[in-house]
Structures are given as structure tokens and as C-alpha cells.
């Protein structure tokens, strides 16, 4: 039943063009090029895409035409290497062009920039957007793909096609509405927020494959799919895991056409085999392709089968545990993970993986002991503290969130994380802590049974953002250690970090705490970021400051901003009152 065993094709580019259709082919090639060459102008990418598309059409007409037998990486890489300004714009990335495939492609992949130096996307007026949409719908939508892809070089390409479809639908509907802005802006906000979340989730999948490998990704997939499809048999889950791993390996490896094609095949397979997978798929499977794939990826967990037997029988009490383990270690551990996960939709995936690792370590030790059964008999008792640790952490943090609200909860985390890893850049600390703080509104509203999978798996995504941003410019050995030692223990590793006693406080710089009237015209979110940036800088100057001291300074700061934004001469107020605030803050913190 292997979905991916295809006949060999004389021309890979013709094969993918025919499978995907011209529209999707062009969109995916644009995404691929924008994710590789993130600084190139839109027009240059469109030109390259058109050239590749015209070439693909000649191969569709005659698969044995010249160069049609070349691999996609060879064709795309050759095209990227024709860019005239490669050396000036990208520096050493230009050296990739001296390499042969597949080294050249992996060289390009390694130069993807998670934090490219690109201007923030500013949303034009609604009328301006609607005019642009009506004037040239195709260019408008291509521009969307380009701008998202270059800022999110690991965005899941077939999912970006789904976002673009929704983006188009929003403009089609709202540009005809009586109140265009009221119709369009909430939709665009939703797409932006969902897009950022989707990008971050995919970045974790790619990081998992890049840094920890296929086995780590497959273990994650076994746990997640077993929770989602608890009625499916182990063989079925294993098959889905193999196919899903192939899809994500392709997308993370820049093979976007193959990835989109295989994702469509996988959705087709899942829908054709719903009966043996899940009862929750019916609605998803009635949708068109892009919606169907998205729906399947987000589908709720199916109900657990009634009367599942105790796990202990097969994995602790059986006399054949060591025999079964020795015969096929990965299969036996996979079965353990499957059985545990399908019984525990209330656990996070990372917790399930920690339990499986503990079980594996115990078997490795005990199956070499004189009395293996005696040695591993109490293995399930070792799980208790591992389960309680995230439960307690989530309970405490949800209580804190409910007490403080999102903004102040974010501030508490900003202080906490700045004290743990003060060497990390202020923008990164602000971005990551704000996202960590969003766990409260996202997960604390859920009942107990859904809190842990929501919270801890979300935190894994956010901490991965910290890891990939830090990897670009490493400044903290503690961050490197937590990010590289174990994928599933990243969150406990960061949670366990105490104040960094080796940190030498930053020199005080009044300029950092000088504010101007422009803060008054910022959105609430931007104003919060300004204040949170100041808070991080305060902690970097005075890492031993107490919560009370920091709260007093931040309250004074909020009052200062409010006062000066109401003043007639705002700029003068900011200059004069600002000096007083800096002096008072220095005194309050003993600087």
C-alpha cells in the first residue's frame, strides 16, 4: 500500500507539472525561489519562474527534449545561479554555485536565514489593496506568496497555497462589501496570526529533521498520530508516519514540488481509508484538495476505543519483553509509544516521548541484567515524576496568567528569561517571551485534559524559535546546551535554568531609555513592545532587581507615557519628564 512508489519518469519536471497543474507549479516554484534567495526583488523571481515554466512546458510536449531529464535541483539550482548579483547580495552563498548537486542544494538550504534583514510588512489602506487586487489579481497573489516565503523560508509550501487561496477569497468577498475594512481587516489579521503559527510549527518539524534526524521526527509523528487516530492499528499508523515523514523531509529539503504532490497523495490515501483510520475525517474528505489537506492536519482526536487493556501486560509483565525488544528495537519501542499515546490524548507529545525514552533506557539496562524482569518491573513508577512536572508547571503558570492577564504575564516571563539567558539579544528575548506568554490565552482556558498537550507542545514550538534565532548568532552556552542536547527536553532544560550568576551587567545607557512622541501614535501592541524592550534592558542592567523594584519602575514608565501623550507639547514632555524618569529609575534600582 505504499503511496510513494511511482514509475520512474523520463522527465521529472514534466511529471510534476502534469501532476500539479500550471497554477500550482508556478506558485510552488516561486515559493522555492523566494525561500532560497530571500533578498531578490519580486520581478526577478517572477522572471525566473516564467522561464522555468516555459521550459517545463517544452518537456511536457516532449519528455526527451534537451535537459528535460535533469533533476529538479539541477534545473532550479542552475537557474538560481544565473542571478547576476548573487555575490554582492548574498556573499558566501554564491560559493554554493561552484558545487555539484546534491551538495549545491544543501549549501543553499544551509544559507536560509530565519531572521532576514527585510522591512516589516506594512499593510496599505484597504482601498489601495482592493485597487491593486482588481488591477492585477495574479500579480497581487504572487506578491503575497513571495513576501511570505522570503520572510518564512521554511513555511510549509502546500499549506502556503492554502493560505493564498484564503487570501484571495478574502479580497474577492470584501472588496465588494459595503464596509470593505470591517470585512477585510479581521480576515487579514486572522491569516497573519495563523500564518505565523503555521510557520513556527513547520520550523520545528524542519529543525527536528535537521538537527535530530528521521528517527526523532518519526517518534514525534507516531505519538501525535496515535493520539489523533487511536482506533487505527499500529501498522496503519506506521504507514502514515512513513509517508508523512517523506512529505516533511521533502519540504524541509527544498523539494517543494515533490512535497506538494506527495501530500496530495497522502490526503487521498487517508480519505480512501477513513474507516481504518478515524471517524472524524468525513467532513475533511468532502473538501477540495488544499482545504482537505489542511483539515486532515488539524482534525480533532478520535474517541479512544473502549476497554483498551492495561499496557503493563505487554510491556512489563510479559516474559517476552526483552526477546521482543531485542528482535526489533525500533518496532517494539514504536508499539510502546503507539499504545501509550492512543491512551493518553491528555499528555503532550514531548511528555510521551520522554516516557518512551525512559522505557528504552530501562530496557537497555535491564535486558543485560541477571534478572531482567525484576529489574524493569517498576519501570512505570519512573513515569510518575515525569508526568507530574509539566502538570505542576502548567497549573502554576495558568494561575499566574489568570491573576495577571496576558501583558503582565508576558512581562513576568520576560524578566524570568532575561535573568536565565541575559546574553540573548533584546529583540529575540522580547519576541520569544511574548510568544511564550501567549500560551496563557491559548491553553489555560482548556479543561485539564487538554491543557498539557496544548501548552507543552506549543512551548516546544516557541522555544524552537529561540533555538533557531540563537543558532544564527550564538551568544549563550546555556541556550546552546538546552537547544542541542535533547529535542524533547528543551522545555524542562530552560525551565530548570536559574539566574545566570556569571553575567556581567550591561553598562547603563540613557539613550536606551529615551522615548519620543512617536510612541503615542503606535498601536497598543507596538507600544507594549516598546515597554517590554525597556523592561528587558532594565533587567540586563540590573539582573538582581526584585519583582517589586521592576514593577515600580514599569508603573512609573506607563504613567510617564500616558502623561506625555496627553500633553500639548509632547516632545518637550518626553524630553524633560524622561530625564526625571531615568534618574528616578536609577535611584529605585540602585544603579
Amino acid at each position: 500500500r505504499g503511496v510513494f512508489r511511482r514509475d520512474a519518469h523520463k522527465s521529472e519536471v514534466a511529471h510534476r507539472f502534469k501532476d500539479l497543474g500550471e497554477e500550482n507549479f508556478k506558485a510552488l516554484v516561486l515559493i522555492a525561489f523566494a525561500q532560497y534567495l530571500q533578498q531578490c526583488p519580486f520581478e526577478d523571481h517572477v522572471k525566473l519562474v516564467n522561464e522555468v515554466t516555459e521550459f517545463a512546458k517544452t518537456c511536457v510536449a516532449d519528455e526527451s527534449a534537451e535537459n528535460c531529464d535533469k533533476s529538479l535541483h539541477t534545473l532550479f539550482g542552475d537557474k538560481l545561479c544565473t542571478v547576476a548579483t548573487l555575490r554582492e547580495t548574498y556573499g558566501e552563498m554564491a560559493d554554493c554555485c561552484a558545487k555539484q548537486e546534491p551538495e549545491r542544494n544543501e549549501c543553499f538550504l544551509q544559507h536560509k536565514d530565519d531572521n532576514p534583514n527585510l522591512p516589516r510588512l506594512v499593510r496599505p489602506e484597504v482601498d489601495v489593496m482592493c485597487t491593486a487586487f482588481h488591477d492585477n489579481e495574479e500579480t497581487f497573489l504572487k506578491k503575497y506568496l513571495y513576501e511570505i516565503a522570503r520572510r518564512h523560508p521554511y513555511f510549509y509550501a502546500p499549506e502556503l497555497l492554502f493560505f493564498a487561496k484564503r487570501y484571495k477569497a478574502a479580497f474577492t468577498e470584501c472588496c465588494q462589501a459595503a464596509d470593505k475594512a470591517a470585512c477585510l481587516l479581521p480576515k487579514l489579521d486572522e491569516l497573519r496570526d495563523e500564518g505565523k503559527a503555521s510557520s513556527a510549527k513547520q520550523r520545528l518539524k524542519c529543525a527536528s529533521l535537521q538537527k535530530f534526524g528521521e528517527r526523532a521526527f518519526k517518534a514525534w509523528a507516531v505519538a501525535r498520530l496515535s493520539q489523533r487516530f487511536p482506533k487505527a492499528e499500529f501498522a496503519e499508523v506506521s504507514k502514515l508516519v512513513t509517508d508523512l515523514t517523506k512529505v516533511h523531509t521533502e519540504c524541509c529539503h527544498g523539494d517543494l514540488l515533490e512535497c506538494a504532490d506527495d501530500r496530495a497523495d497522502l490526503a487521498k490515501y487517508i480519505c480512501e481509508n477513513q474507516d481504518s483510520i478515524s471517524s472524524k475525517l468525513k467532513e475533511c474528505c468532502e473538501k477540495p484538495l488544499l482545504e482537505k489537506s489542511h483539515c486532515i492536519a488539524e482534525v480533532e482526536n478520535d474517541e479512544m476505543p473502549a476497554d483498551l487493556p492495561s499496557l503493563a501486560a505487554d510491556f512489563v509483565e510479559s516474559k517476552d519483553v526483552c526477546k521482543n525488544y531485542a528482535e526489533a528495537k525500533d518496532v517494539f519501542l514504536g508499539m510502546f509509544l503507539y499504545e501509550y499515546a492512543r491512551r493518553h490524548p491528555d499528555y503532550s507529545v514531548v511528555l510521551l516521548l520522554r516516557l518512551a525514552k525512559t522505557y528504552e533506557t530501562t530496557l537497555e539496562k535491564c535486558c543485560a541484567a541477571a534478572d531482567p524482569h525484576e529489574c524493569y518491573a517498576k519501570v512505570f513508577d519512573e513515569f510518575k515524576p515525569l508526568v507530574e512536572e509539566p502538570q505542576n508547571l502548567i497549573k502554576q503558570n495558568c494561575e499566574l496568567f489568570e491573576q495577571l492577564g496576558e501583558y503582565k504575564f508576558q512581562n513576568a516571563l520576560l524578566v524570568r528569561y532575561t535573568k536565565k539567558v541575559p546574553q540573548v539579544s533584546t529583540p529575540t528575548l522580547v519576541e520569544v517571551s511574548r510568544n511564550l506568554g501567549k500560551v496563557g490565552s491559548k491553553c489555560c482556558k482548556h479543561p485539564e485534559a487538554k491543557r498539557m498537550p496544548c501548552a507543552e507542545d506549543y512551548l516546544s514550538v516557541v522555544l524552537n524559535q529561540l533555538c533557531v534565532l540563537h543558532e544564527k548568532t550564538p551568544v549563550s552556552d546555556r541556550v546552546t546546551k538546552c537547544c542541542t542536547e535533547s529535542l524533547v527536553n528543551r522545555r524542562p532544560c530552560f525551565s530548570a535554568l536559574e539566574v545566570d550568576e556569571t553575567y556581567v551587567p550591561k553598562e547603563f545607557n540613557a539613550e536606551t531609555f529615551t522615548f519620543h512622541a512617536d510612541i503615542c501614535t503606535l498601536s497598543e501592541k507596538e507600544r507594549q513592545i516598546k515597554k517590554q524592550t525597556a523592561l528587558v534592558e532594565l533587567v540586563k542592567h540590573k539582573p538582581k532587581a526584585t519583582k517589586e523594584q521592576l514593577k515600580a519602575v514599569m508603573d512609573d514608565f506607563a504613567a510617564f507615557v500616558e502623561k506625555c501623550c496627553k500633553a500639548d507639547d509632547k516632545e518637550t514632555c518626553f524630553a524633560e519628564e524622561g530625564k526625571k524618569l531615568v534618574a528616578a529609575s536609577q535611584a529605585a534600582l540602585g544603579l
Epitope: 546534491p102 544543501e106 529533521l209 535537521q210 538537527k211 535530530f212 534526524g213 528521521e214 528517527r215 528495537k329
Partner: nanobody, 125 residues
């Protein structure tokens, strides 16, 4: 720990063939990816070919495609590289390497944790 020992190198004329072997001992399980790299004097170490231990999927450097074949014998825990139609530019020390995790980037030497000591291949008339 995994130990890798290559053999089969030597001097061969252009157009000739050689078969390199790499015997793996220690814990090699189904998650492994095995690869061949080569290094010519004064040059960087270069990827040649790789194979997934689990499913036998293979990948090759463009310039060796159609001339070299990577394979493995699971029972003997041995990796092979059959090299045909050898050229002067294939002259290098050939290394066998193992990535126990099958990480995404298979051409990157840093992703391979275990290495053999290398075997010299010289193509000359």
C-alpha cells in the same frame, strides 16, 4: 560506539573499476544513514553517495551518477561502493561515514558522527 573500516582502494587505470567495502561493527540499527565521502589533496572533503540503512534509498553526487553504485548488506553489516569507468579526477582518499540519526542534510560531513580511517584510490595510467 560504531567502528568503520574501509578496504578495497588501490591504483587503477582510467576506465577501470574498484569496489570499496566498509565493515561496520558496534550498534548500527535501522535509523542509520551510511555515506561515502572523498578528499583530494588540497581540496575540501566532498560528498560522493549515501544510503539509508532502513529502506535502501540512495543518492549520488552528479559527477558519479551512472558510474558508482552504493549498496549495503545488512546481514554482514557492510557498506559497498562499486566504482566503474573511473577517471583521473576520482583520485582521492575515500571515507566511509555513519549518521546514526539520518539527519536531513546528507552531504554535510558534520552530520556524520562516525568515520573510517580512509582508503586511497588512485586513477592513473
Amino acid at each position: 560506539e560504531v567502528q568503520l573500516v574501509e578496504s578495497g582502494g588501490g591504483l587503477v587505470q582510467p576506465g577501470g573499476s574498484l569496489r570499496l567495502s566498509c565493515a561496520a561493527s558496534g550498534r548500527t540499527d535501522s535509523a542509520y544513514r551510511m555515506g561515502w565521502f572523498r578528499q583530494a589533496p588540497g581540496k575540501e572533503r566532498e560528498f560522493v553517495s549515501a544510503i539509508n540503512w532502513s529502506d535502501g534509498r540512495t543518492v549520488y553526487l552528479d559527477s558519479v551518477k551512472g558510474r558508482f553504485t552504493i549498496s549495503r548488506d545488512n546481514a554482514k553489516n557492510t557498506l559497498y561502493l562499486q566504482m566503474n569507468s573511473l577517471r583521473a579526477e576520482d583520485t582521492a582518499v575515500y571515507y566511509c561515514a555513519a549518521d546514526p540519526d539520518s539527519r536531513l542534510y546528507y552531504t554535510v560531513p558534520q552530520n556524520y558522527d562516525y568515520w573510517g580511517q580512509g582508503t586511497q584510490v588512485t586513477v592513473s595510467s
